[in-house]
Amino acid sequence: EEELQVIQPEKSVSVAAGDSATLNCTVSSLIPVGPIQWFRGAGPGRELIYNLKEGHFPRVTAVSDPTKRNNMDFSIRISNITPADAGTYYCVKFRKGSPDVELKSGAGTELSVRAKPSAPVVSGPAVRATAEHTVSFTCESHGFSPRDITLKWFKNGNELSDVQTNVDPAGKSVSYSIRSTARVLLTRRDVHSQVICEVAHVTLQGDPLRGTANLSEAIRVPPFLEVTQQSMRADNQVNVTCQVTKFYPQRLQLTWLENGNVSRTEMASALPENKDGTYNWTSWLLVNVSAHRDDVKLTCQVEHDGQPAVNKSFSVKVSAHPKEQGSNTAAENTGTNERGSSDYKDDDDKHHHHHH
């Protein structure tokens, strides 16, 4: 008689996670009588997947009715496949006995599970970086299989090239993770910019997953300062203006110093946004020239987003102006700031009322 063959026709089967996998197995003969068992893996550590004779296997069903007369089809269907089900499955014929004796194994069918990557999560630097500096963004996605995957970075639609990507683990696994780092040069125009991490995988049918990060979370645009003097008013007062422009974020404190002494401190709040996402602020100080004998050195000191203060000074010439009796002995502290809608509501109105 011809020797029994255990035939597993497919060398490999690929199934999407959540679907059912059919593993085919037929035997070439009804002889000898005895059950078929399915195992994942070979050798002593193999895992029993299905035993026609006995046991409870809730996710596994026989494709062919096992009670069918002269049944030689021992294919099985495994439902609700997960990446953990990946492996090589063997159909093994046993000879009836007490206990049944293993007789012959099929060549095995490798089950690979196509699992979608998780939505990419993009994270930026923990602290803001100043424009014209380079920062790193990371993108992570997990749980995909097979291992082949493509990840691209874009900034405002332009692909980034300074990228380092790793897929783990390096060896065989039921599922994989990808981690990529992109280095991005920040410019002053990047407040409204966005970086996108795009992941393409066979399971996504050409519709890649995207994760985004706004550069507004990562960037600091330092202000430009300009101090100017308006023309002398009839009442001997000079209006000195400090223009703070093109800064981001809004967190900013401005201090006026007269000859090195603090005259007034203000906090930026509810500023209107420029088209490019930055902010402008103008503060002014009325200086009573007649109260001073000597020239007045005015300093506009700006502390932006916790960074070291930036100063801009201006000297008001008083020698050219006659003194008046009974006038104030100090410059009058008045100032205002441009106001508009803003997300920054931290500072209440006390910062905007200035007392003589």
Epitope: I31, D65, K96
Partner: antibody, heavy 119, light 110 residues
Framework: QVQLVQSGAEVKKPGASVKVSCKAS????????INWVRQAPGQGLEWIAM????????HYNQIFKDRATLTTDTSTSTAYMELRSLRSDDTAVYYC????????????WGRGTLVTVSS | DIVLTQSPDSLAVSLGERATINCRAS??????????IFWYQQKPGQPPKLLIY???NLDSGVPDRFSGSGSGTDFTLTISSLQAEDVAVYYC????????FGQGTKLEIK
């Protein structure tokens, strides 16, 4: 280890019915046919019928078609054979047997249940 | 229905000698290359025990002094060297159609 444990001996009057049980263990009950065979005292083996516990498909020997009914209870892995309108010549040992190879053969047997029909 | 006829009805053989039991079917029991004949041994007070399946295949745990042969309609059970424990009634069964049994052959020691 496959085991088929049958119910105890019965004494019945002619015209009555008997229901013999066969509790299976050591294998998946729904994956194999159960046969019923009887043997009158000093006589040969006579096949009665068979049942597939997975879907209750049955095949009967024409001789018993009108009097025998096979059923199963998959929750307890038990097969039953009821024989109605008993006659004295139904006195026999009734065996259940499991078909392990789906060849319509009898690989494993119960120890038998003696049914005596006597007035 | 297929009718199986065994011969002889009874047989006495000396210990160590060959015993041969025949089974003839009223029509062929062959299908798809298999011969659907089975042989059983029944000792007093015990249920039958499967010896041979599909005409020539020894069941698990059956001593190899037992063998089966034949095809189509004529089949033979052979015990090559009779042992005392082989005393029993032997039945053939077919399953080409629904199961039927032969009438049995009683084997004794001469």
């Amino acid at each position: 280890q496959v085991q088929l444990v049958q119910s105890g001996a019965e004494v019945k009057k002619p015209g009555a019915s008997v229901k013999v049980s066969c509790k299976a263990s050591g294998y998946t009950f729904t994956n194999y046919w159960i046969n019923w065979v009887r043997q009158a005292p000093g006589q040969g083996l006579e096949w009665i019928a068979m049942i597939d516990p997975s879907d209750s498909e049955t095949h009967y020997n024409q001789i018993f078609k009108d009097r025998a009914t096979l059923t199963t209870d998959t929750s307890t892995s038990t097969a039953y054979m009821e024989l109605r309108s008993l006659r004295s010549d139904d006195t026999a040992v009734y065996y259940c047997a499991m078909d392990y190879g789906s060849l319509y053969a009898m690989d494993y047997w119960g120890r038998g249940t003696l049914v005596t029909v006597s007035s | 229905d297929i009718v199986l006829t065994q011969s002889p009805d009874s047989l006495a053989v000396s210990l160590g000698e060959r015993a041969t039991i025949n089974c003839r079917a009223s029509k062929s029991v062959s299908s798809s290359g298999y011969n659907y004949i089975f042989w059983y041994q029944q000792k007093p007070g015990q249920p039958p025990k499967l010896l041979i399946y599909l005409a020539s295949n020894l069941d698990s745990g059956v001593p190899d002094r037992f063998s089966g042969s034949g095809s189509g309609t004529d089949f033979t059970l052979t015990i090559s060297s009779l042992q005392a424990e082989d005393v029993a009634v032997y039945y053939c069964q077919e399953s080409r159609e629904l199961p039927t049994f032969g009438q049995g052959t009683k084997l004794e020691i001469k």
